[in-house]
Interface confidence: low
């Protein structure tokens, strides 16, 4: 009798351990990717940034995948997405092609199943970086809460990539899962 | 027999209550600290801001510690960190030392065990605050997801502290734990 | 005996299912509201934005209510609130009333029980949008962690509403519950 009860208890504990494991906070996917400055495109046009670190310094990833410059969702859910993009220029780098700049970031979602790309968030500013000042700097921050499905991909597009600040504390993006889809 | 079963059930319930308590959402650490304007350093140099409120107005803290101007982590985990910093100047406050300003924020992490300080996030802008306009304002927002260990300290450094907006809705920083470390 | 044990186990499972349901991640309230550009006020004064989408494109809501231009809290808790506001102007839209602009956002909380309104977060910048450039753009992002009670209302005020960017990826605000109140 007592043995039987213990078996029943083990079943209870076992099923609950499974549920606990699934819902435990540390099962939640996340990523924080920092710019890989060795491979930043040049020019002033809008480009997709494909080189990011995922495993050094502040960069890290769990239960998500980084591939071909895109952050791939492995687990359906609602995620908080964010990006911080810094641009800078010093007169020692040479003259700017134009003093009137459009410094922008676009956080995009691509669905592979239905090949399509959509902008989730954008931010930035037009700037007049005059030659009267030897140093210029500007940062953009965007963030928002989005439903993401397994297989969907998040990528970052910027204008004027040659002006990006290559520090890991300056140019990064990330995501963390907040809750399941009902 | 029935008594024994109830004892077993109590054990099951008890162990699960412990697990529930540990993983319950309200156990998660957080802080939202607002600027204490009575003690803002003067000058235009980069300084660490040490005076923040943690228990009035919007400011609050739980399962973290605020001491000596730093937000101290008490519980290992992955945290979302954020800061909002507003700068302003009115001509009635007197002339600016220079019209060319670098308005910046740096969110830093200090590890006591291995005495070292690192910048987790930075943001800001160079600004030309000309005398043609009597009022100037600029805000910076940064946010990111970081692994923090118990004992580590988060602090805020800014340039031009004398230009900080002293309102609690303007200049603040915070953190909340999102998940455990695997 | 065995039947009795199963009844006890069912009771254990039942009570835990209730607890699990309550604490499950997908029970957490959230909202991501995007600007409804068909009803943006004109002018340069500070106004409360009352027209937002909650059920199309990226906009979504769960366990919160959107009514009369305000996001209403249905469940006590600590929430992360955020807003992204983009302003833009093209010379084809006609001249600006003034080249010196104050582009601001205020995230406010209204308590109905004790009728009062308070600003939780603000951000923005003074801008000089000169006629020398045909296009101007500027984005603001703010975010913070706040205790919200059932019945409280979150709303967005901006200056210069006629300059708002009407895209869903540009002008939005949202909230998600992070944890219960102790």
């Amino acid at each position: 009798g007592s043995q039987h009860i213990r078996a029943e208890k083990a079943m209870v504990d076992g099923s609950w351990l499974d549920l606990a494991k699934r819902s435990k906070l540390e099962a939640q996917p996340f990523a924080h990717l920092t710019i890989n400055a060795t491979d930043i495109p040049s020019g002033s046009h809008k480009v997709s940034l494909s080189s990011w670190y995922h495993d050094r310094g502040w960069a890290k990833i769990s239960n998500m995948t980084f591939s071909n410059g895109k952050l791939i969702v492995n687990q359906d859910g609602f995620y908080y997405l964010y990006a911080n993009i810094c641009f800078r220029h010093h007169e020692t780098s040479g003259d700017l092609a134009t003093e009137y700049l459009q410094l922008m970031v676009y956080v995009t979602k691509t669905s592979i199943k239905i090949p399509s790309s959509h902008t989730l968030m954008k931010g930035g500013s037009t700037k007049y970086w005059s030659g009267n000042s030897e140093f210029h700097f500007y940062s953009i921050n965007v963030g928002g809460f989005f439903k993401l499905r397994s297989g969907e991909e998040i990528s970052i597009e910027v204008s004027n990539p040659s002006l990006l600040d290559p520090d890991q504390d300056a140019t990064y993006f990330g995501a963390f899962k907040v809750r399941d889809i009902d | 027999g029935s008594q024994h079963i109830r004892a077993e059930k109590a054990m099951v319930d008890g162990s699960w209550l412990d697990l529930a308590k540990r993983s319950k959402l309200e156990a998660q650490p957080f802080a939202h600290l607002t600027i204490n304007a009575t003690d803002i350093p003067s000058g235009s140099h980069k300084v660490s801001l040490s005076s923040w409120y943690h228990d009035r107005g919007w400011a609050k803290i739980s399962n973290m510690t605020f001491s000596n101007g730093k937000l101290i982590v008490n519980q290992d985990g992955f945290y979302y960190l954020y800061a909002n910093i507003c700068f302003r100047h009115h001509e009635t406050s007197g002339d600016l030392a220079t019209e060319y300003l670098q308005l910046m924020v740096y969110v830093t992490k200090t590890s006591i065990k291995i005495p070292s300080s690192h910048t987790l996030m930075k943001g800001g802008s160079t600004k030309y605050w000309s005398g043609n306009s009597e009022f100037h304002f600029y805000s910076i927002n940064v946010g990111g997801f970081f692994k923090l260990r118990s004992g580590e300290e988060i602090s805020i450094e800014v340039s031009n502290p004398s230009l900080l907006d002293p309102d609690q809705d303007a200049t603040y920083f915070g953190a909340f734990k999102v998940r455990d470390i695997d | 005996g065995s039947q009795h044990i199963r009844a006890e186990k069912a009771m254990v499972d039942g009570s835990w299912l209730d607890l699990a349901k309550r604490s499950k991640l997908e029970a957490q309230p959230f909202a991501h509201l995007t600007i409804n550009a068909t009803d943006i006020p004109s002018g340069s004064h500070k106004v409360s934005l009352s027209s937002w989408y909650h059920d199309r494109g990226w906009a979504k809501i769960s366990n919160m209510t959107f009514s009369n231009g305000k996001l209403i809290v249905n469940q006590d808790g600590f929430y992360y609130l955020y807003a992204n506001i983009c302003f833009r102007h093209h010379e084809t839209s006609g001249d600006l009333a003034t080249e010196y602009l104050q582009l601001m956002v205020y995230v406010t909380k209204t308590s109905i029980k004790i009728p009062s309104s308070h600003t939780l977060m603000k951000g923005g910048s003074t801008k000089y949008w000169s006629g020398n450039s045909e296009f101007h753009f500027y984005s603001i992002n703010v975010g913070g962690f706040f205790k919200l009670r059932s019945g409280e209302e979150i709303s967005i005020e901006v200056s210069n509403p006629s300059l708002l960017d009407p895209d869903q990826d540009a002008t939005y605000f949202g909230a998600f519950k992070v944890r219960d109140i102790d």
């Epitope: - | 009575t38 003690d39 107005g57 009635t92 007197g94 309102d167 | 500070k46 104050q102 600003t119």
Partner: antibody
Amino acid sequence: SVEESGGRLVTPGTPLTLTCTVSGFSLSSDVMSWVRQAPGKGLDWIGYIWSGGRPYYANWAKGRFTISKSSSTTVDLKITSPTTEDTAAYFCARGFGSSGLNIWGPGTLVTVSL
Amino acid sequence: DMTQTPASVEVAVGGTVTIKCQASQNIGYNLAWYQQKPGQPPKLLIYGASTLASGVPSRFKGSGSGTQFTLTISGVQCDDAATYYCQQGYSVSNIDNAFGGGTEVVVK
């Protein structure tokens, strides 16, 4: 709530201290302003004191008034050398900035006369 | 400093009254409006240029930013007879008075 006290008839040149007592909120987190109103006239902002204890004054009030915190629930306004022009109702109010002066006391009357 | 106009205005019950306040410099949205009746302290009506204070009827409306501000009272009632003041809450540096000179509203 806010309540002023200490108003009375004084002769010119005799220092006078008015006290503002607050309850229901904290002086450690709120700015307190002093405002006066001469009979039949408008409101004159004298100055305020930060939650941290630092006072600020209108140009005309500098040197004529001193604002200080005397305890955790009281703020004082000292009229250093009253003249007949200082005859007025003196109000203490919470706030100053974008939220306005949102809690006022009933006022206390100061009469300066020979 | 704050310049308030008009100094006095007469209005019929149900009418509308507009009071203007001009700041000598840009004060953003840091402006409040007050109502004062004889023998009473001022009462906060509007703060942040346009936000209605607790318990204030919606017939009171504040607008403006920078240097130009307006208080509008629509559907005036007898109880609205009072003196109204504006107050800047931005700068305490080098100012003579944070308040406007006041506007007396007489209801007929």
